[in-house]
Structure formats: C-alpha cells, structure tokens
C-alpha cells in the first residue's frame, strides 16, 4: 500500500466563454481508496477555491458554471490526491478561458445541387453556427471548414471556408452519393467536432471538370475566385 | 539569479539537536515547494522532507519522521529543518533544493549544502 | 515506498561513447522521473524530468526515456565534462526517493 500517484489535469475546454469543464487523470493507484479535489486560484489572488461541481462534466473533472467563470482572468489549478498513507499533488495549470474554447458543431447542414441554366452545375451548402455561440456581441469570430468525400472513398477532401456560412464547390464525381460534414473553431481555440455527415446524391448529368473548381470568397453573391486543382490541393487539403 | 544557501550545520552529539536554514534569493520564494535532500559520506542522495509552497502540506522521508521538522518563513524567504534527537546515521551533508512548482515536482535548484556530523 | 534501482552502479566509458544507464521503479511511477547528474564537491544538477523532458540549458546529447517502471538515460556522445555520478528520482509520490547513483568514470 502507498500514497496515491501524482494527478495530472490535462484538459480545459469551454463551450462559448461562459462557462468551462477541466479533466485529470488519476494519478498510480496506491492500493487504497483514493479521493481527488481540484483547487484553484485566479492569478493575483491568494484565496484557493474548491471545484464547484464534481458531478456535471463526468468523472475526474471540475465544471465551472457561469458564475465561476471569468473571462480575462488566468485559473491557477491543481488536483490534489489522498488516501489513507499520504497525499499527491499535480502540477499546476494555469487556464485563461479565451485560449479554451471548443464549439459544439455547427447546426442544420444543408446540401444540394444546383443546376443553373446558364453555368456550370455546383454543390451549394449552407449552414448554422451553434446555438451557444453568440456572435453578435464580437467576442467570436468562428471559422469553417467542410469536408466530403464519396460515401465509399477513404480519404477525405477539406476546403476552409473562413467566416462564410455558405459554400460551392464544382467538381465532383457523377453519379456519386457524397457524405458532407462542417466544423468550426473560434479565432483562439479548438475545432468543434465534426457535424453529423450529411448525404447528398450527384446526379449522374452533373458535368465534371477536372481543371479548376469554383469556390466563393465571401458569400454567394460576393466575388469569386477561380482556384487551380494545385493550388486547391495546396490550400485546403489537410 | 536563484541562490540557496544553507546554515547551521556542526558538530553535534547523539541525542542532541541541531538547527538547519536556508536562505533563499532572485525568486519569488513563496511560488515554490521546497525540500531538505542529504548526502551522507561517499553515499547517494536521500530526500528528507518537503514542504509546499503555503505550508499546506509536509513530508518526511521514513528515517527522520517523529525526530525533525521542516518549516518555511515566506516573509523571510527561508526554510527550515528542525533536527531532533540526533544519531550518527544523520551525518551527512543537507542541501536545500527547489521544487520546480508550487507543490509535487522535481528540483530544479539546490544549495550547496551544510555539513552535519552527529558524533560523541 | 518505492524503491529505485539504477544499474550499472559504475560505468568505464570513454570520450564518445554512446552510454545508457538504466532506472527501474518498484511501483509504476507514469512519467514522473527526473535524472541528475553531481560532480565531486558539488550539488546535483537537474537534466531531466517528466522521463524524457530536457531541462532548459542541458546539452542536447543527454535524452531520457520510459515510462511505468523503466527509465532510459542516455549520453549519445561522452564528453569530458560528462563524468559524474547520475541519480534518478521519482516524484510520482509526495514521498521522493532516488536511485542509488551511477559513476560513470574514464576507461
């Protein structure tokens, strides 16, 4: 039997600014019952805090409601570990909430085909920011990237979409069926998780053209500029 | 620059106590744990006692528990060991070191250290 | 307590030797292990923590390793200011304890 092993918090993430959920990892277990509290400080201070809920972010995390989350203030937290032969302590980690930020995925994905009579056919997309994000006051700026592939291909296609909402993209495969995904990040922070795929069948008319694709810059009635599949790959490939 | 100098070390008879200090510079003293490690004669390092950052916690390595005591001045920027009822196997020489945080890490600076000898 | 084993105890190496000295914890540790190296008459100098994390100003030669129970230290190229004593030191618990050193002296 021994005292527990060292903790280590090793993530913070927040929904939107307003409130945040940080995780440890159980230190090496000493053969005894262990209990884990998370303290913490705002840096300047010398008052310690315990979490303020254990339950709602699951197991071996601290949640953070509204009213313990403070934008513009740096946390300084630590797990300590104890059981009956002795206490372990984690490093410290010092979490500012702008630098944390991870959206949920963006809402109501929208796909289709467009076939204008007087251009070339294109897949237009369209899509919803999350509801948690508030943009309006410009504390966000949240950017897009887009990723589809044909439902029976490995790899990938990405192409960034930057603040834009809407997006086209000419070229692809007749006669395919395509899975169609979006995420977002805000300007400091981390990319949601993908949104659920959205399918989306190419007609088999659909003219293909290998040499360039068509992406729009601002929204659809904006400029747009006409990227070379080099260039393309270059760019928006991850 | 970080400086730790340790005081207090001597001659001292079995049974006897002696007072060990270390004088802390060019950190913010308290933002640290701090440890009292020893070096008996041609022998390795022995950790001794440890001390966090508020004194909110302490520990003792098994061969001192119930005899010493280890205390910080963060006013002072000093640390302290308390030695007590000394035995010929405490001899050796006791540097300070810095924790690399506040509370469970590894050290980062040490003294030089202050020679103890526990001797009739 | 966790108990610390470092083998060799002693090493004969020369200038440019490639040397690996290896520690071994009684309990898993994770990453928590730190490596020292002291000088006769001076104090222990850090080298490495966290098992593989190399300490601001350390020449790029010493490298760390393992994790769990098995600990790597290594010297990719011996010079002359490398022979000393090496200590490794788990942190894992409040309670620290170091290996019994290894000398690494001139062939």
């Known amino acids: 039997q021994l005292p527990p092993g060292k903790p280590e918090i090793f993530k913070c993430r927040s929904p939107n600014k307003e409130t945040f959920t940080c995780w440890w990892r159980p230190g090496t277990d000493g053969g005894l019952p262990t209990n884990y509290s998370l303290t913490y400080h705002r840096e300047g201070e010398t008052l310690m805090h315990e979490c303020p809920d254990y339950i709602t972010g699951g197991p071996n995390s601290c949640h953070f409601g509204k009213q313990y989350t403070s934008m513009w203030r740096t946390y300084v937290m630590m797990v300590n570990a104890t059981n009956q032969m002795g206490s372990s302590f984690s490093d410290e980690l010092y979490v500012d909430v702008t630098y944390i930020v991870q959206p949920d995925p963006p809402l109501e994905l929208t796909v289709e085909v467009k076939q204008p009579e007087d251009r070339k056919p294109y897949l237009w997309m369209k899509w919803s920011p999350p509801t948690l994000i508030d943009l309006k006051t410009g504390w966000f700026t949240l950017l897009y990237e887009i990723r589809l592939k044909p439902e029976k291909a490995a790899e990938w296609e990405t192409h960034f979409a930057g603040q834009q909402t809407e997006f086209k993209i000419l070229s692809l495969h007749p006669g395919q069926k395509y899975l169609v995904q979006v995420r977002c990040k805000p300007d400091h922070g981390y990319w949601s998780a993908w949104s659920p795929a959205t399918f989306i069948q190419i007609p088999s008319d659909f003219i293909m053209n290998d040499e360039q694709k068509l992406i729009s810059e601002e929204d659809l009635g904006g400029e747009q500029k006409l990227i070379s599949e080099e260039d393309l790959h270059h760019h928006h490939h991850h | 620059e970080v400086q730790l100098v340790e005081s207090g070390g001597g001659l001292v008879q079995p049974g006897r106590s002696l007072r060990l200090s270390c004088a802390a510079s060019g950190f913010t003293f308290d933002d640290y744990a701090m440890h009292w490690v020893r070096q008996a004669p041609g022998k390795g390092l022995e950790w001794v006692s440890g001390i966090i950052w508020n004194s909110g916690h302490i520990g003792y390595g098994d061969s001192v528990k119930g005899r010493f005591t280890i205390s910080r001045d963060n006013a002072k920027k000093s640390l302290y060991l308390q030695m007590n009822s000394l035995r010929a196997e405490d001899t050796a020489l006791y540097y300070c070191?810095?924790?690399?945080?506040?509370?469970?890490?590894?050290?980062?600076?040490w003294g030089q250290g202050t020679l103890v000898t526990v001797s009739s | 307590d966790i108990q610390m084993t470092q083998s060799p105890s002693t090493l004969s190496a020369s200038v440019g030797d490639r040397v690996t000295i290896t520690c071994r914890a009684s309990h898993i540790i994770s990453s928590w292990l730190a490596w020292y190296q002291q000088k006769p008459g001076k104090a222990p100098k850090v080298l490495i923590f966290k098992a593989s994390s190399l300490e601001s100003g350390v020449p790029s030669r010493f490298s760390g390793s393992g994790s769990g129970t098995e600990f790597t230290l290594t010297i990719s190229s011996l010079q002359p200011d490398d022979f000393a004593t090496y200590y490794c030191q788990q942190y894992n618990t409040y309670s620290r304890t170091f290996g019994q050193g290894t000398k690494v002296e001139i062939k």
């Open positions: 070191a810095r924790d690399s945080g506040r509370y469970q890490s590894y050290f980062d600076y």
